[in-house]
Interface confidence: medium
């Protein structure tokens, strides 16, 4: 029975009727609504904000919405013992410490709650000496350091700037380099664009501005207490020193005006070229140690926040389907934020918000979705996006049976010039198609489509005419559903020129300025982006719940798998002596990846040709097309990250952020000339090649005729 | 938060022990409830839990005794513990559970098991 | 895992520093070690939680500490109304134990 029939009308005005519901005032308002006091995970007022958006949820007229609750480890300061960094004198005075917190922005004077900077996750301590610039912490900044200018960073508190990389990676790095301490801190050449005021004359980071967050190394883990399982009340939990992923030295993160005074100071060596340059007055002196006058002071870190079992809340609304009520398609993002949440989360819960309640509108006219469609709000993705991979646990043997698709809903706006979408190859069609149907909302685009002023701003460096669509990394709730369980994953937001702001994300980020007004006055003042964003994304949920046939084309997979394969080839061509010596072959994989084009070529003939009245047939059908993505799923998971179990996409193992493509063998690659070992190391290549080959011949099969 | 326990006070031996928690100030959706005693002039002795999701776990050596139910829209919490000995005579205390710990107890209900 | 407490009994003064120790039998977590307070004739109250946090309404002067299986219970300067036994309480895995308690009274 088709999801249609009730209501006689067609499926074309469906999606038509559930776009025109979406308005921008809406979003405005539920926007304001969210951002008016802190909402930090674990606090009294994230879990009201929670029953507040589960009874509004219910009003819109979703057929459920429930509470889902886990107590998992946190992080926060010490209210009474504040953290800082201090400058000390020969004789332990101090003669200058850190600010303790960010000047609030007007009219925010008197809100409480507003939780200082901090690492969240960071061990005590109060480590002092010399310090070392580090740039951006980054690998290839420690391999610059170590090797070329042979300093060592053991036994010294290191101070990197933030952007580039996820913070945890820097961390993760600036330990295993032996530093006993890390500083981060925001440099205006990174988040201060030229020609543009700081907060609150504009959309710029002030000197006072700090960048919190979390600096974990889960590798998909989630609960740091309870990996794998869901921390629920009879959860079996590690002890601390057992946890997965913590730092295990101080780290605290400071604005650039403290900056400046740590840095003007510094030392030592000269920076190595001017990609270590940022725009402060100091000469980014690498270190160790303060310059002459200087030598003998000291830098001390006082850190003495505390890691604390909390209780956390995802909101879980269900829109019942009417024709295949097993599948699921699901439209997730957090709504914890570090303080007012402008940003990040709430310009994307708020659109999450007006989906429902569009959603809603439709069902109380009689209208429903042929397959289930799952909301959530989730909470704890500030702190390693426990409430989404909990939750994820706790479900995931109905996740793997019945997951279709997963679309992510943080934030709505990193900037307002053009889309950006990071997505599965299987949904690039549905996008393409989807955003030729949109209007853009850009200046200079009217009456022109969605799809043609994000291809003339972001077009892809492969295929002319169309616009660049980039591979899922992490960072985001979409982690758990697609790099642990294969469930096919997509994201949209708008995004700023990345040609002419080089900037790290957005200036105002995870910082107390990430206000409602930096969004009304200076990103959206009209919500157009955000609108032209819940089309997206609310467009591809209804496609995904409403379609007779799954959009997905597997033919797209096949054309990024042979370049992926092409790629990982010419990085192992860099050795070719080795190759030769090892008998490294990459033939099984391009043999592999042959077959799967094949397959997939006759699966989408078939695809047209099916009777899709026949409804044994087309769920067969469907299916195959559902589980495609589950097929590169090694229950193994990678090597010493057993949480990402996706043979063709991963976390970057140097940047959470990032995307990589066959991750198993790029990191078996990665820096092999200076492995110990060179054969066993080039074995691992070999075992990687045969472990890629084979999971994209098992996909491939799985688009085989069935009988 | 508040926990009452009600029960009956006198209890023959053999016969079956059934104890009633109510609880206020918290939902019984949300935290788990754990059951301990206490003999007179004793230590406190852990009995069960049942959790918010309705799971239970009871301490090895009364397994086979004890049961514990629950009524989430009354919040009210049952304990039924059979065969009584006089050794089983003690203050039962129900306390909400949170992440291993008990945080919040009731004022206990006295249990003497005597003919 | 088994808990035990020592002294059993002991006596102090009004000022004096008090410290009472929980043993385990076998490694336990610090942030699964706690304590509660119990007045004669009424119900037990969390007293300090994982190892070393203080619950809501306990004054300044007691403090804990501790790692692996040896954890302690300290009052800075004893008052009257401390006079009490004090439990340990352990989980590594169900079921959650009790040590015996420390039974505090006044000189």
């Known amino acids: 029975k088709s999801s249609n029939e009730a209501t006689n009308i067609t499926p074309k005005h469906n999606m038509k009727a559930f776009l025109d519901e979406l308005k921008a005032e809406n979003i405005k308002k539920f926007l304001y609504n969210f951002t008016q006091i802190p909402h930090l995970a674990g606090t009294e007022q994230n879990f009201q904000l929670a029953k507040q958006i589960q009874s509004q949820w219910k009003e819109f007229g979703l057929d459920s919405v429930e509470l889902a609750h886990y107590d998992v480890l946190l992080s926060y300061p010490n209210k009474t013992h504040p953290n800082y960094i201090s400058i000390i004198n020969e004789d332990g005075n101090e003669i200058f410490n850190t600010s303790l917190f960010e000047p609030p922005p007007p009219g925010y004077e008197n809100v409480s709650d507003i939780v200082p900077p901090f690492s969240a996750f960071s061990p005590q301590g109060m480590p002092e000496g010399d310090l070392v610039y580090v740039n951006y912490a980054r690998t290839e900044d420690f391999f610059k350091l170590e090797r070329d200018m042979k300093i060592n960073c053991s036994g010294k508190i290191v101070i990197a700037r933030y952007g580039k990389v996820f913070r945890g990676n820097k961390v993760k790095n600036a330990q295993l380099a032996g530093a006993k301490g890390v500083i981060l801190y925001s440099d205006p050449a990174d988040y201060f664009a030229p020609g543009v005021k700081s907060y609150p004359d504009g959309w710029n980071l002030p000197g006072g501005g700090v960048q919190r967050g979390n600096i974990l190394n889960l590798n998909g883990a989630g609960d740091p207490l309870t990996p794998g399982y869901p921390a629920n009340e009879y959860a079996y939990r590690r002890g601390i020193a057992e946890a997965v992923g913590l730092p295990s030295i101080p780290v605290h993160p400071i604005g650039y005006y403290d900056a400046q005074k740590l840095l003007e100071k510094m030392g030592g060596s000269a920076p190595p070229d001017s990609s270590w340059r940022g725009s402060l007055k100091v000469p980014y002196n690498v270190g160790p140690g303060f310059t002459g006058n200087f030598s003998t002071q000291k830098v001390k870190m006082h850190i003495h926040s505390t890691n604390e079992v909390t209780r956390i809340y995802n909101v879980i609304g269900t829109l019942r389907g009417a024709v295949e009520p097993d599948r699921y398609v699901i439209l997730g993002g957090h709504r914890d934020s570090w303080v007012f949440g402008g940003i990040d989360p709430q310009s994307g819960a708020a659109v999450v918000h007006e989906i429902v309640r569009s959603f809603g509108t439709l069902k109380k006219e009689g209208w429903r979705p042929r397959r289930t469609i799952l909301f959530a709000s989730w909470d704890a993705e500030e702190f390693g996006l426990l409430g989404s991979t909990e939750w994820a646990e706790e479900n995931s043997r109905l996740l793997q049976e019945r997951g279709v698709a997963y679309i992510n809903a943080d934030s709505s706006i990193e900037g307002n010039y053009t889309l950006r979408v990071d997505c599965t190859p299987l949904m690039y069609s549905l996008v393409h198609n989807l955003t030729k149907e949109l209007k853009s909302p850009d200046e200079g685009f009217e009456g022109k489509s969605l799809y043609e002023s994000w291809t003339k701003k972001s077009p892809s460096p492969e295929f002319s005419g169309m616009p660049r669509i980039s591979k899922l990394g992490s960072g985001n709730d979409f982690e758990v559903f697609f790099q642990r369980l294969g469930i096919a994953s997509g994201r949209a937001r708008y995004t700023k020129n990345w040609e002419t702001n080089k900037f790290s994300g957005y200036p105002l980020y995870h910082s107390v300025y990430e206000t409602y007004e930096l969004v009304e006055k200076f990103y959206d003042p009209m919500f157009k982006y955000h609108l032209t964003v819940a089309q997206v994304r609310g467009g591809m949920v209804f496609e995904l719940a409403n379609s007779i046939v799954l959009p997905f084309d597997c033919r797209d997979y096949a054309v990024v798998l042979r370049k992926y394969a092409d790629k990982i080839y010419s990085i192992s061509m860099k050795h070719p002596q080795e190759m030769k010596t090892y008998s490294v072959s990459f033939d099984s994989l391009f043999s592999a990846v042959k077959n799967f084009t094949e397959i997939a070529s006759k699966f989408s003939e078939r695809l047209q040709d099916f009777d899709k009245s026949n409804p044994i047939v087309l769920r067969m059908m469907n299916d195959q097309l559902m589980f495609l993505e589950r097929a590169f799923i090694d229950p193994l998971g990678l090597p010493d990250r057993p949480f990402y179990r996706h043979v063709i996409y991963a976390p970057s193992s140097h940047n959470k952020y990032a995307g990589e493509s066959f991750p198993g063998i790029y990191d078996a690659l990665f820096d092999i000339e200076s492995k110990v070992d060179p054969s066993k190391a080039w074995g691992e290549v070999k075992r990687q090649i045969y472990v890629a080959a084979f999971t994209v011949q098992a996909a491939a099969e799985t688009l085989s005729e069935v009988a | 938060v508040k926990l009452q326990e009600s029960g009956p006070g006198l209890v023959a031996p053999s016969q079956s022990l059934s104890i009633t928690c109510t609880v206020s100030?918290?939902?019984?959706?949300?935290?788990?409830v754990s059951w301990i005693r206490q003999p007179p002039g004793k230590g406190l002795e852990w009995l069960g839990v049942i959790w918010s999701d309705g799971n239970t776990y009871y301490n090895s050596p009364l397994k086979s005794r004890l049961s514990i139910n629950k009524d989430n829209s009354k919040s009210q919490v049952f304990l039924k513990m059979n065969s009584l000995q006089t050794d089983d005579s003690a203050m039962y205390y129900c306390?909400?559970?949170?992440?291993?710990?008990?945080?919040?107890w009731g004022q206990g209900t006295s249990v003497t098991v005597s003919s | 895992t088994v808990l035990t407490q020592s002294p059993a009994i002991m006596s102090a003064s009004p000022g004096e520093k008090v410290t009472m120790t929980c043993r385990a039998s076998s490694s336990v977590s610090s942030s699964y070690l706690h304590w509660y307070q119990q007045k004669s004739s009424a119900s037990p109250k969390l007293w300090i939680y994982?190892?070393?946090n203080l619950a809501s309404g306990v004054p300044a002067r007691f403090s804990g500490s501790g790692s692996g299986t040896s954890y302690s219970l300290t009052i800075s300067s004893l008052e009257a109304e401390d006079a009490a036994t004090y439990y340990c309480?352990?989980?590594?895995?169900?079921?959650?134990?009790f040590g015996a308690g420390t039974k505090l009274e006044l000189k």
């Open positions: 994982r190892t070393s």
């Open positions: 100030g918290f939902s019984l959706t949300d935290y788990g």
């Open positions: 306390a909400r559970h949170k992440v291993y710990t008990m945080d919040y």
């Open positions: 309480q352990q989980y590594s895995g169900y079921p959650l134990t």
